[in-house]
Interface confidence: medium
């Protein structure tokens, strides 16, 4: 099939390949302090790390990209580490009528892959 | 709202920001020459280019990532250019019983964004 098996062990050493990492950010960091009330600090999971050949390939396109990057590194970029899924979070914010709770579905990464 | 407006004009100059580019690849390049019969050459659209602050942000997460990259560039990577959608392609390939046509939904990028 078109799918070579995505590799899950990192050939670059521990913590170097695409993975989920938690970054603390305040509302001030995000520029949201004027409208978001709570929480004032968010635990933001983000995708960081490198994408060596076939590591956690998102799909066939990513596998092709990895292969062509090996052949034409100046023309085709390596796959990069991006969210594969998200964890919804709740923010409390100001509205015209007071305060409300709102869910954001695409704010915090839950999983990562190489695309 | 959490969504600042993603920027669509490239501040780095023409062709430098995240966009779709066509790459020619033979079945030999892809390592598929033993099982794919046709086409012998593929026009592969791929996502290339940089993702400056808020350019074509995929979602709220990407906007946050861009902002935190500005604050902590060593810790948080910049968003990167990946497919937002795909164009299905049909490949003719060998099977145990002869030849068949198969559609691949995730092989050729149709649009790009910064994630």
């Amino acid at each position: 099939s078109a799918h070579a098996h995505p590799r899950d062990s990192c050939p670059l050493g521990p913590g170097r390949c695409c993975h989920l990492e938690t970054v603390q950010a305040t509302l001030e960091d995000l520029g949201w302090s004027d409208w978001v009330l709570s929480p004032r600090q968010l635990q933001l999971s983000m995708c960081v790390g490198e994408c060596p050949h076939l590591y956690r390939s998102a799909n066939t396109h990513a596998q092709i990209k990895a292969r062509l990057h090996g052949l034409q590194p100046d023309k085709v970029p390596a796959p990069c580490c991006v969210p594969s899924s998200y964890t919804p979070v709740v923010l409390m914010h100001r509205t015209d009528s007071g305060v409300s709770l709102q869910t954001y579905d695409d704010l915090v990464a839950r999983g990562c892959h190489c695309a | 709202s959490a969504h600042a407006h993603p920027r669509d004009s490239c501040p780095l100059g023409p062709g430098r920001c995240c966009h779709l580019e066509t790459v020619q690849a033979t079945l030999e390049d892809l390592g598929w020459s033993d099982w794919v019969l046709s086409p012998r050459q593929l026009q592969l659209s791929m996502c290339v280019g940089e993702c400056p602050h808020l350019y074509r942000s995929a979602n709220t997460h990407a906007q946050i990532k861009a902002r935190l990259h500005g604050l902590q560039p060593d810790k948080v990577p910049a968003p990167c250019c990946v497919p937002s959608s795909y164009t299905p392609v049909v490949l003719m390939h060998r099977t145990d019983s002869g030849v068949s046509l198969q559609t691949y939904d995730d092989l050729v990028a149709r649009g790009c964004h910064c994630a």
Partner: antibody, heavy 119, light 107 residues
């Protein structure tokens, strides 16, 4: 560790007011909101309202609107809940609780303050 | 307001039993449901948040599931210290609301 410590039990006459305090420690007070929840004897939990410690913005339960006021003092990391025009059916244990947080949980609770309204 | 309906209101069980408590929201609340345990004279304790995430320090015999309007708390093997009252709570929107509680009693 994260703790919310409330003021002691109160006995009040109908028509009076009560002010319960809730002192936070072990976390950044202004990073969360404080909920007030009460529980009448033998009954379930009733949410009274919420205040953000950071800005003082509030959201009160409709049935208590006009009788309840929630405030915070960031210099002492303390939240307050004042309930006025007390009636016998306000007799309850009053809890402060931190949250909701990022995942909508109310995760840390005070030990509770018993308020008895009796003539 | 979103009404939270818990069932059963009480359940008699023995140590080692599997106990399931359900909670139904009057409208969709995504995954914004928490479960609390309360023992007499004590404050509630958070067990499960975001419908299925186990709070740190809570034994793995407790699990939560569900999304939208129907949710379940399961205690896989009831222990003596689990006899208590359990409440569900939604934080999808204000006002925050609680279920009526389920008392787990010794059979």
């Amino acid at each position: 560790q994260v703790q919310l410590v409330q003021s002691g039990a109160e006995v009040k006459k109908p028509g009076a007011s009560v002010k319960v305090s809730c002192k936070a420690s072990g976390y950044t007070f202004t990073s969360y909101g404080i909920n007030w929840v009460r529980q009448a004897p033998g009954q379930g939990l009733e949410w009274m309202g919420w205040i953000t410690a950071y800005s003082g913005d509030t959201n009160y339960a409709q049935k208590l609107q006009g009788r309840v006021t929630m405030t915070t003092d960031t210099s002492t990391s303390t939240a307050y809940m004042e309930l006025r025009s007390l009636r016998s059916d306000d007799t309850a244990v009053y809890y402060c609780a931190r949250g909701p947080g990022q995942y909508a949980d109310v995760d840390v609770w005070g030990q509770g303050t018993m308020v008895t309204v009796s003539s | 307001d979103i009404q939270m309906t818990q069932s059963p209101s009480s359940v008699s069980a023995s140590v080692g039993d599997r106990v399931t408590i359900t909670c139904r929201a009057s409208q969709g609340i995504s995954s914004w449901l928490a479960w609390y345990q309360q023992k007499p004279g004590k404050a509630p304790k958070l067990l499960i948040y975001a419908a299925s995430s186990l709070q740190s320090g809570v034994p793995s015999r407790f699990s939560g599931s569900g999304s939208g309007t129907d949710f379940t708390l399961t205690i896989s093997s009831l222990q003596p210290e689990d006899f208590a009252t359990y409440y569900c709570q939604q934080a999808n929107s204000f006002p925050i609301t609680f279920g009526g509680g389920t008392k787990v009693e010794i059979k």
